[in-house]
């Protein structure tokens, strides 16, 4: 393991596909992948009238957009389906939406609001 990197070996698993088929597929997913590739966890969800509906959670494989992210945070502004990924065991247990605002006029005292967390 490279110093400072969180190795991902397992992730929280949920799959709405399986839920609707009444097979109760939730649990902990072991992440497998090529030796030279990095492994991540992810969460994807929808916000339907303020209600969070999880679509899937589990392992995600070697995506540069997930490198060195310890928290699962969606930064896109108002996506149709929210997605975040992270590194570290079970790091997708909690996920959040924290859009990166386009800053047109910098303020003298920028404030970073705390992202809303879901779990």
């Amino acid at each position: 393991a490279i110093l400072g990197r969180s190795e991902t070996q397992e992730c929280l698993f949920f799959n709405a596909n399986w839920e609707k088929d009444r097979t109760n597929q939730t649990g902990v997913e072991p992440c497998y992948g090529d030796k030279d590739k990095r492994r991540h966890c992810f969460a994807t969800w929808k916000n339907i009238s303020g209600s969070i509906e999880i679509v899937k959670q589990g392992c995600w494989l070697d995506d540069i957009n997930c490198y060195d992210r310890t928290d699962c945070v969606e930064k896109k502004d108002s996506p149709e389906v929210y997605f975040c990924c992270c590194e570290g065991n079970m790091c997708n247990e909690k996920f959040s939406y924290f859009p990166e605002m386009e800053v047109t006029q910098p303020t003298s005292n920028p404030v970073t609001p705390k992202p809303p967390y879901y779990n």
Partner: antibody, heavy 120, light 107 residues
Amino acid sequence: QVQLVQSGAEVKKPGSSVKVSCKASGRHFGSLQISWVRQAPGQGLEWMGGIIPIYGTANYAQKFQGRVTITADESTSTAYMELSSLRSEDTAVYYCVKDLTWTNLGLDIWGQGTMVTVSS
Amino acid sequence: EIVMTQSPSSLSASVGDTVTITCRASQGVSRWLAWYQQKPGKAPRLLIYGANMLRSGVPSRFSGSGSGTHFTLTISSLQPEDFATYFCQQSYSTPFTFGPGTKLEIK
């Protein structure tokens, strides 16, 4: 690296059943996501269903519900697909496939395929 | 059921060309889209997963893009071994469905 080896070709009569096996070599069989996909001669690909052996329960495409049974035996690292009430349109190559992840990111390792011919 | 369509259904190209194949989903599938290559008498081979991630061992001339309902597979600098049939597949919602395929032939 997982390898999937399937049972040999079958010729079946209409109305009968066929059971195709898929033996996995390598580690972690119980916690793999195994799917079954078929391809009729000269046609496209059709997902039939899948199973994670440690869970034991399978997920089926509605089209095959009631006619297909997917099972797995962890002790022998073997997955099975049984299709009943066979008809001529079930003539196809049947593949067992390992998925990259439990959430079905991509079908990355394929068996060699089993040709099932349904003919009277 | 999510219906996948591909265009074109076939195309002719020459070695060294760049080609693009399009796949559309009847409903949004987020990033749950994969691309496969199949040669006659062989099992399909995974090329791209997660819409744009290259499977280990697949040459970098293959690339995928898109999200939601519209996806593309691009093959740059075609090689003789690239002439085959290409399928897209969504695995966002069961039943997982494949596109009808695009046959890439030598001009």
